[in-house]
Interface confidence: low
């Protein structure tokens, strides 16, 4: 049934859903409050460039007695119950802000007519790429990909002489929501990934990573996973590791090697670190530390998500434009607007864009450092430490293949 | 609307004191950043002070007037007040009142932030030697 949009008259409502299925086990009553300080920075925005207009949340939670499990796992019914309840309640706001499980945001996309733009703090699968009115607000697997790719190709650096093509991927089935997204990724057969490597196998039990590591017949110098530092130390121990083998450790949304104090542990030295750029005035800053670092992104993505539509809206009434039609739907995409930390780009797909950054463990110092930066919005990498103190020979990272040329 | 007015400034020989007020109104939402900012003529705005404005607890001060400043409010009036002792002639400026939003979990400001959202007309201070 069509359902009427409180999104006019000088009143414009946002739809949040509060899903018990969540990407990150994050309490709704901090989600609440992400909004609720959002909504009041749209206010001042708008009453700021003159624009005397209301803008409310409405929460819709589930009953949470059938989608119980609190992961992903049941989310896919459960955010279609709750589109339902806004059906019947005939109640829809401008925008939905909601659904962080890539299934239920994949089911939702399928199953509704969006004729209202959706803002998600997730739905990181490849399965949520190029859909015209999602937009994503955490970094999704694809931007994960092009990085990796363009950082396996690269072979002018300094420290990277190589190109790679070749890779392990450790996947157990165990990860959260964000890492198995990006795995699974990495492991589908018809991914960009897939497609540019020659080999790659994924290890599904402890015992087969722990074997490569000391594996003369491997077939490949490169690891990747996805987790923290306790992940990794917890599968790989104080095992001794191959001279030539890398590890490459998926770390996103955690800004703690950014800390002043952290000195990285010694089975820390074989592994490069990819992790996210911290936020503007993060560092040496009051920021809260209350919140684990990735429940604080998800957090700040719903926050996000709120300063974001309140952008969109300042544009369309500045310009006149009416909210309830397909191009206010189709326009969060292709823009930068100010977020909480600063800018915040979006691209032509409406995924959030970012500074990826590569990290190594400084045999000298034993602290996290800088390597290189990549920048999604342009494909692109830059350098930062030309001669990064290495624990591998040379200080050049070896090549994939052990053996193929001088190492 | 947020709406934010300053008064207390004026002159006073160096040593002296001060004590600078603000009076809030329009609020729709429970925890602001409060602070109190100042420039000096051909100066950039620099933050003096920040408290959260539903916590009594955690003030921010810049290293520069630490000791001798403190920010404290009357939530009941919707009132914030700078106290400035010791003032010295480095201190003059106009002092300016601001607000934000933009506290996270836990009741924290960002220290260093700059872009307040609401910010009032400004009272100035001389400090002469």
């Known amino acids: 049934s069509q359902v009427s949009q409180n999104c006019h008259n000088g009143s414009y409502e946002i739809s949040v859903l509060m899903m018990g299925n969540s990407a990150f086990a994050e309490p709704l009553k901090n989600l609440e409050d992400a909004v609720n300080e959002g909504l009041e920075i749209v206010r001042g925005r708008l009453q700021n460039a003159g624009l005397n207009v209301t803008v409310n949340a409405t929460f819709m939670y589930s009953d949470g007695l059938i989608h119980n499990s609190g992961d992903c796992r049941s989310s896919t019914c459960e955010g279609l119950d709750l589109l339902r309840k806004i059906s019947n309640a005939q109640r829809m706001g401008c925008v939905l802000i909601g659904p962080s499980c890539t299934y239920s945001t994949f089911q939702m996309y399928l199953d509704t007519e969006l004729s209202y733009p959706m803002i998600s703090a997730g739905s990181f699968g490849l399965s949520c790429d190029y859909k015209e009115t999602l937009t994503r607000l955490m970094s999704p697997a694809r931007k994960l990909m092009y990085f990796l790719v363009n950082f396996w190709k690269t072979n002018d650096l300094p420290f990277k002489t190589y190109s790679w093509s070749t890779s392990y991927v450790y996947k157990n089935g165990t990860e959260t929501e964000d890492c198995f997204w990006y795995l699974n990724a990495l492991e589908a057969s018809v991914s960009y990934f897939s497609h540019e490597l020659g080999f790659k196998v994924v290890l599904r039990q402890d015992k087969e990573f722990q074997d490569i590591l000391m594996d003369h017949n491997r077939k490949s110098n490169v690891i990747i996973m996805c987790g923290g530092p306790e992940f990794l130390y917890k599968l790989k121990g104080d095992r001794a590791v191959a001279e030539d083998i890398v590890i490459i450790l998926v770390d996103l949304f955690n800004d703690q090697y950014f800390e002043d104090n952290v000195t990285a542990p010694d089975y820390m030295k074989n592994v490069l670190v990819l992790t996210l750029s911290p936020g503007n005035s993060l560092l040496n800053s009051s920021f809260s530390r209350n919140l684990s670092p990735t429940k604080r992104d998800f957090a700040l993505a719903y926050l996000n998500g709120i300063l974001l539509f309140g952008h969109m809206l300042k544009i369309f009434l500045e310009n006149g434009e009416n909210i309830t039609t397909p191009k206010f739907a189709h326009a969060f995409r292709n823009l930068t607007f100010e977020g909480y930390d600063g800018p915040v780009t979006l691209d032509d797909w409406g995924d959030v864009d970012s500074t990826m950054v590569l990290l190594y463990t400084s045999v000298d110092t034993k602290k996290y450092k800088v390597l290189l930066t990549y920048d999604t919005h342009v494909n692109k990498t830059y350098p930062v430490d030309m001669s990064p103190t290495f624990t591998w020979k040379n200080s050049k990272l070896p090549n994939d293949i052990t053996g193929r040329g001088p190492q | 609307q947020v709406q934010l007015a300053e008064s207390g400034g004026g002159s006073v020989q160096s040593g002296g004191s001060l004590r600078l007020s603000c009076a809030a109104s329009g609020y729709t939402y429970s925890r602001y950043c409060m602070a109190w900012f100042r420039q000096a003529p051909g100066k950039e705005r620099e933050g003096v002070a920040v408290?959260?404005?539903?916590?009594?607890?955690?003030?921010t001060y810049a290293d520069s007037v630490k000791g001798r400043f403190t920010i404290s409010q009357d939530n009941a009036k919707n009132m914030l007040y700078l106290q400035m002792n010791s003032l010295k002639p480095e201190d003059t400026a106009m002092y300016y009142c601001?607000?934000?939003?933009?506290?996270?979990?836990?009741?924290?400001?960002?220290?260093?932030?700059?872009?307040?959202?609401?910010w009032g007309q400004g009272t100035q201070v001389t400090v002469s030697s």
């Open positions: 408290i959260v404005s539903d916590n009594d607890g955690s003030a």
């Open positions: 601001a607000a934000d939003p933009r506290v996270w979990y836990g009741g924290t400001c960002r220290a260093g932030r700059t872009d307040f959202l609401y």
